[in-house]
Interface confidence: low
């Protein structure tokens, strides 16, 4: 534990005096005291000297020396009084904030211990303290108002008798903040309610608080309902419960129900909506387009939202063709309940194969009947291209067939040299075929188109390329004649390279 010199608990000096406080410890030491002017600090290893050669009343206070490295946290203290005949009080703070029932320390420090007998606490402008104000005084620390109340939030002054007259400190504002837990906690069950006319229903509104002084009511639209209140106390909380029992609901029972609870802190409310329907209902919908296009090999999740009352008695996904009689695997279908009356059903279709294109239907059943929602899934394919040489009406013709989905566009290129694919530098001519002939176009299948390029003479050191593209990708086929004058020979005498 550090040691302070002079080794007295209190030191009394006059204004203007020189004061030297020395602290010695095993390791480095630190001083802590009221913020006041004129102090000089010298530190030298395990000792620290706090000194002033012009003490003022503002230096009055307790100075504590601590040894930061000491695991036991030992400290020593000395209280300094600078007894100024004109200044009996040193006020360390002009605003003090506490919560109700805490002790509030008003830090007016007496500058002369001799004056202790004549001290008192008053409100500003000499007004007496409020009734039941319980306080004590310490010359080292000031006045403490015990278990402060909100009403004691006032401006105070410390008073001392000097030569038969009362001398006041500057004022200290005390703010006592109320500790109120807040509005009561509420529950309203259920959060949403649907019933068919004639069925029974129950709505429960409950509120709880640590304080018994609160009100709770259940409101239907703007009408406050008169419901007998059930009260309880458990888990250190008061609970008040209102239970609305409707044996046979009718349309006038529908609407907004608000559970409202209030106390001195304010009000909380929570609401629910009660829907009364004529008969069972079952509505299927999807945020997705019912016509889906996906690239082959990719995945797709089909989602259906179901709104139903009463609850579902059955549901399933079905594949309606046209490619095979396979059915979706149950493990790829899942259901999630959003709330009591709304559910989401998802069918996962990973890595789609050509045979999985077609119609998928979600079917659901409740007492209101069956409902179905059908998705049409078309797969997208990049074009596949082939070219053959043939004669049409006596003219030599290159015939290009392209198959893909969406329908491919066709472009012909003629380029110099023999190549698998024409590049820009080699291109001699380009023909776009804006209207290739559609050979086949069936739902859920690829579209096959055919484009004809009439060529009077096939140039021998050249390549003819048919390119097809769509939104998925592109494909091409290069046709290379291998001898001059080939146009006079039938197609099978020519080499063509895919």
């Amino acid at each position: 534990i550090p040691v302070i010199e002079p080794s007295v608990p209190e030191l009394v000096v006059k204004p203007g005096a020189t004061v030297t406080l020395r602290c010695v410890g095993n390791g480095s030491v630190e001083w802590d005291g009221p913020p006041s002017p004129h102090w000089t600090l010298y530190s030298d290893g395990s000792s620290s000297i706090l000194s002033t050669n012009n003490a003022t009343f503002q230096n009055t206070g307790t100075y504590r020396c601590t040894e930061p490295g000491d695991p036991l946290g030992g400290s020593a203290a000395i209280h300094l009084y600078v007894k100024d005949p004109a200044r009996p009080w040193n006020v360390l703070a002009q605003e003090v904030v506490v919560f109700e029932d805490q002790d509030a320390l008003l830090p007016c420090l007496l500058t002369d211990p001799v004056l202790e007998a004549g001290v008192s606490l008053v409100r500003v402008r000499g007004r007496p303290l409020m009734r039941h104000t319980n306080y004590s005084f310490s010359p080292w620390h000031g006045f403490t108002i015990h278990r402060a109340k909100f009403i004691q939030s006032q401006d105070y002054q410390c008073s001392a008798l000097m030569g038969g007259r009362k001398v006041m400190s500057i004022s200290i504002r005390l703010k006592v903040q109320k500790v109120i837990p807040g509005p009561p906690a509420l529950t309203l069950v259920p959060a949403e309610l649907v019933r068919i006319r004639g069925e029974a229903a129950q709505i429960v509104c409950s509120a709880s608080s640590v304080d018994v002084n609160f009100d709770v009511f259940l409101q239907h639209n703007n009408t406050k309902l008169a419901i007998p209140q059930q009260s309880d106390f458990h888990n250190n909380r008061y609970q008040k419960v209102l239970t609305l029992n409707l044996d046979q609901v009718d349309f006038q029972h529908a609407g907004n129900y608000s559970c409202v609870a209030s106390n001195v802190q304010g009000k909380h409310s929570t609401s629910m909506f009660f829907r009364v329907v004529e008969s069972a209902y079952l509505n299927l919908s999807s945020e997705q387009n019912l016509i889906q296009e996906v690239t082959v090999g990719e995945g797709l999740n089909l989602k259906v939202m179901v709104e139903a009352y009463p609850g579902l008695q059955g549901f399933n996904w079905t594949y309606l063709g046209p490619f095979s009689d396979h059915q979706p695997e149950p493990k790829l279908a899942n259901a999630t309940t959003k709330d009591t009356y709304r559910h989401t059903f998802t069918l996962s279709l990973p890595r789609l194969k050509p045979s999985e294109a077609g119609r998928y239907s979600f079917l659901a059943r409740n007492p209101g009947g069956w409902r179905a929602l059908t998705f049409e899934l078309t797969l997208r394919y990049p074009p596949e291209v082939s070219v053959i040489w043939t004669f049409i009406n006596g003219s030599g013709t290159l015939l290009c067939a392209a198959s893909g989905y969406p329908q491919p566009n066709v472009t012909w290129l003629q380029c110099s040299g023999h190549t698998d694919r024409c590049d820009e530098a080699q291109v001699l001519q380009v023909w776009d075929d804006p209207y290739p002939e559609v050979l086949s176009q069936e739902p859920f299948h690829k579209v096959t188109v055919q484009s004809l390029l009439t060529v009077e003479t096939l140039e021998h050191n050249q390549t003819y390329e048919c390119r097809a593209h769509n939104s998925v990708g592109s494909g091409s086929w290069a046709f290379i004649p291998i001898s001059a004058g080939a146009h006079t020979h039938p197609p099978d005498e020519f080499l063509f390279t895919p």
Epitope: S153, G182, P183, G266
Partner: antibody
């Protein structure tokens, strides 16, 4: 120093909604209730409600129940007042006001003029 | 809701003269629990936000000159200005906050003669 800075003027059509913000600085935002008060042109002051910034709890004047929503974002020390289904008689200057721990309104925002006109 | 009624609605005053504004509530603003009377006075100067003058019946807000004072009890309250200055012009409002909704008086416009 304590400051409440409100968002700029708004012009809205009847039936629309408006959301006014009030950014607090210079004090602990969650330590004080924030109230909203409005003043129609040439008229007096009208209390709308309060929000407890620490819990988000609110208390609205009955007149505005169902149309007013008071929210806050403690991360940016900002309170919001949203009024929906606006009518021409909602044309007013809307003020936020801090409630001191002694309950009185010690600081007010500069006001936001909301004009509702077709 | 508690109704607050102010009189007069307009108050022309000569600088240096005293002024008095009355406010009446439809029910008592005295809180029996803590003994406080929850009535406040505000001044709204032209083109400005309201500013607090007096809170909890008689406490002057920070920075308010001691020319302003509040008094009253129960349901009848008075704001007094001992010597009116040119800077005091504006609309004065009383407000109750003993219960929700807080309500204001209709305002008293103080003008300089």
């Amino acid at each position: 120093q304590v400051q409440l800075v409100q968002s700029g003027p708004e012009v809205k059509k009847p039936g629309a909604s408006v959301k006014v913000s009030c950014k607090a600085s210079g004090y602990t935002f969650t330590g004080y209730y924030m109230h909203w008060v409005r003043q129609a042109p040439g008229q007096g002051l009208e209390w709308m409600g309060w929000i407890n910034p620490i819990s988000g709890g609110t208390n609205y004047a009955q007149k505005f129940q169902g149309r007013v929503t008071m929210t806050r974002d403690t991360s940016i020390s900002t309170a919001y007042m949203e009024l929906s289904r606006l009518r021409s008689d909602d044309t007013a200057v809307y003020y936020c006001a801090r409630q001191d721990n002694w309950n009185y309104f010690d600081y007010w925002g500069q006001g936001t003029l909301v004009t509702v006109s077709s | 809701d508690i109704v607050m009624t102010q009189t007069p609605l307009s108050l022309p005053v000569t600088p240096g003269e005293p002024a008095s504004i009355s406010c009446r509530s439809s029910q008592s603003l005295l809180d029996s629990d803590d003994g406080n009377t929850y009535l406040d006075w505000f001044l709204q100067k032209p083109g400005q936000s309201p500013q607090l003058l007096i809170y909890t019946l008689s406490y002057r807000a920070s920075g308010v000159p001691d020319r302003f004072s509040g008094s009253g009890s129960g349901t009848d309250f008075t704001l007094k200005i001992s010597r009116v200055e040119a800077d005091d012009v504006g609309v004065y409002y009383c407000m109750q906050r003993i219960e929700f909704p807080f309500t204001f008086g209709q305002g008293t416009k103080l003008e300089i003669k």
